[in-house]
């Protein structure tokens, strides 16, 4: 559904979007898995958390993530189509005081301990471009999404609308 300029054009206003209110509109715990049903797991190693993408054994418990959903307002003069728009942004916290962060320089996804208000690097624009799957776009770097690379989470540049549905940026949320 994109014109020739693709993802860069439709995301150009993300930098300027403001999150309305400081409290989330809803929060809930869910396990995160890839399009191919691999689980996203979090392990404490040497006093820091590592993030893995792996197949779980049959009865192994899935790690849960607290997803906090925020509403973000786009004034019409920034949205490019003459209407005020709203987006959903999420933060993801697998354990108390730790949040997923986008490290745009390293193209990596990291867990950082931080206090509220959270930095922009902890916010991701929520997309559901595919039936019952979601994608997470960096608020700080439009067109860059959380994805799976070599059994780890990484930041992946999506440079055309066709690539918005590549399986490596699609995730499933499950409350079970």
């Amino acid at each position: 559904a994109f014109g020739i300029s693709g993802v860069q054009k439709y995301t150009r206003a993300l930098h300027d979007s403001s999150i309305t209110g400081i409290s989330p509109i809803t929060e809930y715990l869910a396990s995160l898995s890839t399009y191919n049903d691999q689980s996203i797991t979090f392990a404490l190693e040497d006093e820091s958390y590592e993030i893995y993408v792996e197949d779980l054994k049959k009865d192994e418990k899935k790690d849960k993530v607290l997803l906090s959903y925020y509403e973000s307002q786009h004034p019409s003069n920034e949205s490019g189509d003459g209407v005020d728009g709203k987006m959903l942004m999420v933060t993801l916290s697998p354990t108390k005081d730790f949040w997923l962060h986008a490290n745009n320089k390293e193209h990596s996804v990291e867990l950082h301990k931080c206090e509220k208000p959270l930095p922009d690097q902890a916010f991701f624009v929520l997309h559901n471009m595919h039936s019952n799957c979601v994608s997470f776009e960096c608020k700080t770097d439009p067109g860059v999404f959380i994805g799976v690379k070599d059994n780890h989470l990484a930041l992946i540049k999506v440079d055309s609308s066709e690539n918005l549905c590549t399986e490596n940026i699609l995730f499933k949320l499950s409350e079970t």
Partner: antibody, heavy 121, light 107 residues
Framework: QVQLQESGPGLVKPSETLSLTCTVS????????VHWIRQPPGKGLEWIGV???????SYNSALMSRVTISEDISKSQVSLKLSSVTAADTAVYYC???????????????WGQGTLVTVSS | DIQMTQSPSSVSASVGDRVTITCLAS??????LAWYQQKPGKSPKLLIY???RLADGVPSRFSGSGSGTDFTLTISSLQPEDFATYYC?????????FGQGTKVEIK
Amino acid sequence: QVQLQESGPGLVKPSETLSLTCTVSGFSLSKYGVHWIRQPPGKGLEWIGVLRAGGTISYNSALMSRVTISEDISKSQVSLKLSSVTAADTAVYYCARDHYYYSSFGGFASWGQGTLVTVSS
Amino acid sequence: DIQMTQSPSSVSASVGDRVTITCLASQTIGAWLAWYQQKPGKSPKLLIYAATRLADGVPSRFSGSGSGTDFTLTISSLQPEDFATYYCQQLNSTPYTFGQGTKVEIK
């Protein structure tokens, strides 16, 4: 301002294909999903499918074998085709726009006025 | 598919009454529920989204509550223009199913 307008023939013969167009203005199809919903006379609402902002399409599995949704970006149009129609497909057909950019979680904020399609010979 | 069950199917009420409509999802849908108002011959109008959020231009006498599987739409003081049919809809997963509707009629 945001507008959606359904158009197409009001009468379709059984076994033929129903074709409707939703022409949108005031927003970009690259940011918002557009849904098709129908409502048989005196009955409730049924979701048919969606053309998402990324260009992907999801259908109601109950209709999937008969339904096709497509778009013409240059004309800001989203089309619905429903094949092999019967009297049970007689309904008011609506197109509607997502409340949120890029996702459908916030429901449908703007609706067309609807167009009645009667299936009869 | 997720089934949405609304109750009651109809309610008779007077202007000024408090009206409550409930919606039950067959499985958990988080907060991804919307409420619509529809008047005869008109398109549905979004009232509430994300279970509790008031859509733009909707009077504050409308409110939504609930999460998971149980949801409620409340009209705190019914006005003449509120007589209509109300639908809930889940947006957690496709197909995005609607409740069967609740008709609010004049007593």
